[in-house]
């Protein structure tokens, strides 16, 4: 797998690998259009989860506000569905016992925002 | 910072840390069989980038298909805007010189999908 050494090399001691300090492109930032979460036809709110033993410590989850979508008149159109857009992301988990600190990758499912779709199933007419 | 040992502890040798093998929730998956990218009023296409020295090796980027949004008649409505939804995610970069393998985290900006918004400025009437 990705994290294993080539077969011709001695195995990794104690089932751990070397992680270099520092993050490439650490200061890279999202530059999304302003307030898209409230201007969207499928608006959403954000919930922030905080964990000091996770990097990044702050993970933001979006939650769609409506079941249907908002039309040009600001009314809900129930012939359309608001659906979440999800993304798998990696975070780093910190584990420490005294001065012995190790890290482990964790896969997290993040809802990034919502989009308005034509329904496949018509639960509601 | 997150990756440094407590001050009372001896410094990390050679500027690297211990990364445990294995990924928590590795089999967690986004339900992608939904075709939301083509059913959305702000549809998008995907481009896949592949890098064998990155984990995950495959990173998928979305590109909005239209400037406007698609109305109920399937026509583009230029009074509304399709905008990308972006997310910062972590990937792991693998660096090797012979049998010496090390890893480093990298921040990557991913466009996950698109949403339809009411414009702030009406460039197009």
């Amino acid at each position: 797998t990705f994290f294993q050494k080539p077969e011709s090399c001695p195995p990794v001691p104690g089932g751990s690998m070397k992680l270099d300090i520092g993050i490439i492109n650490e200061n890279q930032r999202v530059s999304m259009s302003r307030n898209i979460e409230s201007r969207s036809t499928s608006p959403w709110d954000y919930t922030v989860t905080w964990d000091p033993n996770r990097y990044p410590s702050e993970v933001v989850q979006a939650q769609c506000r409506n079941l249907g979508c908002i039309n040009a008149q600001g009314k809900e159109d129930i012939s359309m569905n608001s659906v979440p857009i999800q993304q798998e992301t990696l975070v780093v988990r910190r584990k420490h016992q005294g001065c012995s600190v190790s890290f482990q990758l964790e896969k997290v499912l993040v809802t990034v925002g919502c989009t308005c779709v034509t329904p496949v199933i018509h639960h509601v007419q | 910072t997150f990756f440094q040992k407590p001050e009372s502890c001896p410094p990390v040798p050679g500027g690297s840390m211990k990364l445990d093998i294995g990924i928590i929730n590795e089999n967690q998956r986004v339900s992608m069989s939904r075709n939301i990218e083509s059913r959305s009023t702000s549809p998008w296409d995907y481009t896949v980038t592949w890098d064998p020295n990155r984990y995950p090796s495959e990173v998928v980027q979305a590109q909005c298909r239209n400037l406007g949004c698609i109305n109920a008649q399937g026509k583009e409505d230029i009074s509304m805007n399709s905008v990308p939804i972006q997310q910062e995610t972590l990937v792991v970069r693998r660096k090797h010189q012979g049998c010496s393998v090390s890893f480093q985290l990298e921040k990557v900006l991913v466009t996950v999908g698109c949403t339809c918004v009411t414009p702030v400025i009406h460039h197009v009437q």
């Epitope: 709110d45 919930t47 989860t49 993970v59 989850q61 979006a62 939650q63 769609c64 506000r65 409506n66 079941l67 249907g68 809900e76 569905n81 608001s82 659906v83 979440p84 999800q86 499912l109 993040v110 809802t111 779709v117 329904p119 496949v120 199933i121 639960h123 509601v124 | 339900s31 939904r34 939301i36």
Partner: nanobody, 123 residues
Framework: QVQLVESGGDLVQAGGSLRLSCAAS????????MGWFRQAPGKEREFVAA????????KYTDSVKGRFTMSRDNAKKQVYLEMNSLKPEDTAVYYC????????????????WGQGTQVTVSS
């Protein structure tokens, strides 16, 4: 793993009322909507109602519109189904579930269901 516990089902006369409750635990931070579903004997499970956790926005299947009202308590992570003017055709086992994709969630996407609560409406 989402844990769901439904309660409040009973035997009632046609025209009567019931209030069903559903306690949900283990929901993720991105959980966006909850739904009530029902399964009558010999029939497939069907959608009854849905609610958005954030806005309280509700949607109902045509056959229950005007008679059933879904509500939620975010602090308790509970949803309710107020059922009025009950009809014999409302007889079924009622289930609640997370709707991770809102009204776009398909029945075949559900892995886990609670035990449900039996509603019987006699004529």
């Amino acid at each position: 793993q989402v844990q769901l516990v439904e309660s409040g089902g009973d035997l009632v006369q046609a025209g009567g009322s019931l209030r069903l409750s559903c306690a949900a635990s283990g929901l993720t931070g991105s959980s966006y909507a909850m739904g009530w579903f029902r399964q009558a004997p010999g029939k497939e499970r069907e959608f009854v109602a849905a609610i958005s956790w954030i806005s309280g926005d509700t949607k109902y299947t045509d056959s229950v519109k005007g008679r059933f009202t879904m509500s939620r308590d975010n602090a308790k992570k509970q949803v309710y189904l107020e059922m009025n003017s009950l009809k014999p055709e409302d007889t079924a086992v009622y289930y609640c579930n997370d709707m991770p994709y809102g009204l776009d969630t398909r029945m075949d996407e559900y892995v886990y269901w609670g035990q449900g609560t039996q509603v019987t409406v006699s004529s």
